[in-house]
């Protein structure tokens, strides 16, 4: 057999379909690998051939297109199952060829089972809705091409096990499900079941998606740097460890890249000849607002280091902000020191390790706080 451009197994397209439902699978060659479409290929005399390898088998075999009621058929660059069976799971290959040209790609197809509440191993797409933002809609996905526009299917929407009937803030409107106003309680899995007739038979398409309610752009603000701030002075003796947390709050913004970084004397830490480590942690609120903390650490700080400028920077699609940390070399004899308690929120551990000096409103008195948990 002559050489064939083999694109291998395209695991990026892990196709999952429900058992006992129609499935239309386009040959990925025309979508992702070749510069021309099926019509061009067909008119150039190229033929599209399909075959498959069953699950847990090595043997490639032709697809049986002579099954009763044309259960599996091919139409242009689409492989049709009407409907799927569990044992259709396997790796499918589409090959485009003539006497002088050959190109092929394989992809995995998994036929999955669901229960009556639509629980299954299916990977679910996530649709984000803005909290308290006004009417927003989700649309029953991936149903195009299954039936002609002349066919009017029936669509039923479910949340979990239960049918959604015009109630509260969620209203089914055909292929759309409208959220009059979205709340955190609307988080969850929503399923549309599309039922349509074809050649005297009735088919069902089940599509589940996850709704995640996120922060509204109406409430979005530029990044807010909580730390460093004007109330905290990092006073250290040479040889001690310097730890400065940079804690930044980011409003949720669709497709925004949130960035936090430190500069030391206006340069990136990597460009400074000192031993600096930076550890980052990220947490999210229920509406996907983000808090990023980058802790800058110098194990054994020198008096030179204590003269440097340490600036925390943050950027999102809403803007860029920066805040300098106040770093000082500890004076040998402070006027007095008070041992005391008192909570300072989430950074207690860092503050305790630091024995941070707190500047009381305008006065010159420094207080050591050893925090107890």
């Amino acid at each position: 057999s002559e050489r064939c451009d083999d694109w291998g197994l395209d695991t990026m397209r892990q196709i999952q379909v429900f058992e006992d439902e129609p499935a239309r699978i386009k040959c990925p060659l025309f979508e992702h690998f070749l510069k021309f479409n099926y019509s061009t290929a067909h008119s150039a005399g190229l033929t599209l051939i399909w075959y498959w390898t069953r699950q847990d088998r090595d043997l490639e075999e032709p697809i049986n297109f002579r099954l009763p009621e044309n259960r599996i058929s091919k139409e242009k660059d689409v492989l049709w199952f009407r409907p799927t069976l569990l044992n259709d799971t396997g790796n499918y290959t589409c090959m485009l060829r003539n006497t002088t040209y050959c190109s092929k790609v394989a992809f995995p197809l998994e036929v999955v089972q669901k229960d009556s509440c639509f629980n299954s191993p299916m990977k679910l797409p996530v649709h984000k809705l803005y909290i308290e933002y006004g009417i927003q809609r989700i649309t029953c996905p991936n149903v195009d091409g299954y039936f002609p526009s002349s066919v009017k299917p029936t669509i039923t929407w479910y949340m979990g096990c239960y049918k959604i009937q015009n109630f509260n803030n969620v209203i089914p409107e055909g292929m759309n499900l409208s959220f009059l106003i979205a709340f955190i309680s609307n988080n969850g899995n929503y399923t549309c079941v599309v039922t349509y007739p074809e050649n005297g038979r009735t088919f069902h398409l089940t599509r589940t998606l996850t709704v995640k309610v996120v922060g509204s752009p109406k409430n979005a603000v530029p990044p807010v740097i909580h730390s460093p701030n004007d109330h905290v002075v990092y006073e250290k003796e040479p040889g001690e460890e310097l730890l400065i947390p940079c804690t930044v709050y980011f409003s949720f913004l669709m497709d925004s890249r949130n960035e936090v970084w430190w500069t030391i004397d206006g340069k990136k830490p990597d460009d400074i000849p000192i031993d600096v480590t930076i550890n980052e942690s990220i947490s999210h609120s229920r509406t996907e607002d983000e808090t990023r903390t980058q802790i800058l650490s110098i194990k054994k700080v020198t008096s030179e280091d204590l003269k440097r400028s340490y600036v925390c920077h943050a950027r999102s699609a809403k803007g860029e902000v920066a805040k300098a940390a106040t770093v000082k070399q500890k004076v040998p004899a402070p006027r007095y020191t008070v041992e005391g308690g008192g909570g300072t929120g989430g950074l207690n551990d860092i503050f305790e390790a630091q024995k941070i000096e707190w500047h009381e409103g305008g006065g010159h008195h420094h207080h050591h706080h050893h925090h107890h948990h």
Epitope: Y158, M159, G160, C161, K163, I164, V170
Partner: antibody, heavy 120, light 107 residues
Framework: QVQLVQSGAEVKKPGSSVKVSCKAS????????ISWVRQAPGQGLEWMGG????????NYAQKFQGRVTITADESTSTAYMELSSLRSEDTAVYYC?????????????WGQGTLVTVSS | EIVMTQSPATLSVSPGERATLSCRAS??????LAWYQQKPGQAPRLLIY???TRATGIPARFSGSGSGTEFTLTISSLQSEDFAVYYC?????????FGQGTKVEIK
């Protein structure tokens, strides 16, 4: 501790309706679903339908469609099951049962049951 | 609708013995099956879901197995409090349906 407390026993005439309540304690309404299951004397269990109280989303067994209405009042954490056009074969203990989540089709907590007797 | 058939209708077992209860579905329900225990005058209690996962607080002597159409509930060593009626429930298809029950009585 999760508790589902149902209303008391009822005696009804054929052709009438009955409305049974199920009050949840322990903040169990939010994010859960409540189903109604009945058990005729000496018989097995029969699922009638259910609701996600937060959404008013319901599902009914075909057998009871049009005759049963399941509702919920979130403010009082109470679910209701109303069965109309009663006949003698509707004599049964009616249970409310909580799903472990809106996506779980099994029942992890049950009410104590309400006996409904249909007799002329 | 899917018909669930339990056997035997009554099972007589001595305390400490093993009890094996069977539940058969009229068509495949995958692993979408639950087991409940009901004592006289009480509401049912969830034992097993997903055919084999024990519910919270259920002793290890209760185990479930099977998939498709054949399922088994095993009580490895019967205690006095285990004498009751046991029901299986399928939730693969609407409507959810229960078996008619197996009564486990003292021999």
């Amino acid at each position: 501790q999760v508790q589902l407390v149902q209303s008391g026993a009822e005696v009804k005439k054929p052709g009438s309706s009955v409305k049974v309540s199920c009050k949840a304690s322990g903040g169990v309404f939010s994010g859960y679903a409540i189903s109604w299951v009945r058990q005729a004397p000496g018989q097995g269990l029969e699922w009638m339908g259910g609701i996600i109280p937060e959404f008013g989303a319901t599902n009914y067994a075909q057998k009871f469609q049009g005759r049963v209405t399941i509702t919920a009042d979130e403010s009082t954490s109470t679910a209701y099951m109303e069965l109309s056009s009663l006949r003698s074969e509707d004599t049964a203990v009616y249970y409310c049962a909580r799903h472990s989540s809106a996506y779980s089709p099994w029942f992890d907590y049950w009410g104590q049951g309400t006996l409904v007797t249909v007799s002329s | 609708e899917i018909v669930m058939t339990q056997s035997p209708a009554t099972l007589s077992v001595s305390p400490g013995e093993r009890a094996t209860l069977s539940c058969r579905a009229s068509q495949s329900v995958s692993s979408n099956l639950a087991w409940y225990q009901q004592k006289p005058g009480q509401a049912p209690r969830l034992l097993i879901y997903g055919a084999s996962t024990r519910a919270t607080g259920i002793p290890a002597r209760f185990s479930g197995s099977g998939s498709g159409t054949e399922f088994t509930l095993t009580i490895s060593s019967l205690q006095s409090e285990d004498f009751a009626v046991y029901y299986c429930q399928q939730y693969n298809n609407w409507p959810w349906t229960f078996g008619q029950g197996t009564k486990v009585e003292i021999k």
